[in-house]
């Protein structure tokens, strides 16, 4: 305030504007621009202890251009806002605030969460998973022959990973026990994995029993045909109904 004492603005007429710089329409030695040429924005620029008027084609960061008939100026964004479109619509908030619908908030509203990278309030994203893929072939120690009881597995993909406050993903792998008619491995089949075998229709009489397993086994493979008599088929249908519980494991 002391700096202003004794330094006075002469009451001047706008047509006394000799020596005006750049976009000034009227000016004074002490104050710089007093008014601007059309379409330019008036702004106060600090030079040391002094503020002088300048005329700009666009406003600096932290300001937005206000236009009234024949008089434009750079107007400050709100205190919590770094860049704004107008007084009521912020486009980037100051540190510690989150942007939501043009406003800067300390905390995000209900149903939204803070993204600390973009510093915006964003919708909570819940996990989304695909449908289950078909069960893998019934295998034991990687083989699809030479055993009676084995395991089979199925998987599903994560389509949408959850955000911080979103619902966690459900299990993406399921494994269960399975039983097939014991079949000797043919010559050259020993050690072959299910995925190397020729795809065939699954056996109608196959029995499944769920077991917990954290291994991710081969997916989408079918079980080779097995010959069974009608009595065996009936027996297996009853077993299927009794053993339908499935235990899931997450990977």
């Amino acid at each position: 305030q002391n700096a202003s004492r004794g330094r006075r603005q002469r009451r001047m007429h706008p047509n006394v504007s000799q020596g005006c710089q750049g976009g000034c329409a009227t000016c004074s030695d002490y104050n710089g621009c007093l008014s601007c040429k059309p379409r330019l924005f008036f702004a106060l620029e600090r030079i040391g202890m002094k503020q002088i008027g300048v005329c700009l084609s666009s406003c600096p960061s932290g300001y937005y251009g206000t236009r009234y008939p024949d008089i434009n100026k750079c107007t400050k964004c709100k205190a919590d806002c770094d860049t704004c479109f107008n007084k009521n619509f912020c486009t980037k908030c100051k540190s510690g605030f989150y942007l939501h619908l043009g406003k800067c908030l300390d905390n995000c509203p209900e149903g939204l969460e803070a993204n600390n990278h973009t510093m915006e309030c964003v919708s909570i994203v819940h996990c989304e998973v695909s449908e289950w893929n078909p069960w893998s072939p019934c295998t034991k120690k990687g083989k699809t022959c030479g055993f009676k009881r084995g395991t089979e597995t199925r998987v599903r993909e994560i389509i949408q990973h959850p955000s911080a406050k979103g619902n966690l993903c459900p299990p993406t792998n399921e494994t269960r026990k399975c039983t097939v008619q014991r079949k000797k491995c043919q010559k050259g089949e020993r050690g072959k994995k299910g995925r190397e075998r020729k795809r065939k229709k699954p056996n109608k009489g196959e029995s499944k029993e769920a077991i917990p397993d954290s291994k991710s086994l081969e997916s989408s493979k079918e079980i080779p045909e097995q010959r069974e008599n009608k009595q065996q088929q009936k027996k297996r249908k009853v077993q299927d109904k009794q053993k339908s519980v499935s235990v899931s494991t997450v990977h």
Epitope: Q1, A3, S4, Q9, R11, M12, H13, P14, N15, A25, T26, C27, S28, N31, G32, C33, L34, S35, C36, F42, L44, Q51, I52, G53, T66, Y68, P69, D70, I71, K73, T75, K76, K78, A79, K87
Partner: antibody
Amino acid sequence: EVQLVESGPGLVKPSETLSLTCTVSGDSITSGYWNWIRQPPGKGLEWIGYISYSGKTYQNPSLKSRITISRDTSKNQFSLKLSSVTAADTAVYYCATYYGYGGPWFAYWGQGTLVTVSS
Amino acid sequence: DIQMTQSPSSLSASVGDRVTITCKASQDIDSYLSWFQQKPGKAPKTLIYLTNRLVDGVPSRFSGSGSGTDYTLTISSLQPEDFATYYCLHYDEFPLTFGQGTKVEIK
């Protein structure tokens, strides 16, 4: 020295239109911004609106629907019309000018004219 | 619209006193503030603009300060001719609004 002088009837009937003129000397109204301001008796100041050097106008939104500001450059005058007046429009009406954000606002004022709204 | 709250609404002081009048804006007005003096039956007279710049012919006992939302007019040593009503005005955006006024009376 810039001088502004308001003129117009001192008494206006309710629902009629108040009309005032400001005559400017010492400067051209084709420079700067020419304003109307009013002050009800014993109360504070209220800005009404302006007409710019090019003839464009801006009015206080609280009065906008009733205000017309115009000018006559040949006479170096600008005018205020306020329609549908009521007793609440009784005030001293001033004209005043400024030249831009970097200079003094309302550096020059008219002496004011009292307008009474009464039947 | 930006509201300007001026205080006090009136004050009693003696010649030679230091007088302070404040104006608070409802939002940051970025130094676009003027102070006016009005005597009974007269038009207001501009004292200060852009927060702290004295208009030509205004005595240096008048000074202005402030930033953001808070602004002050100070009369360092009150003189007999200073007894009047003082108004602040913001011109950061339209519509322009004045404070309600502060009447400075003789104690």
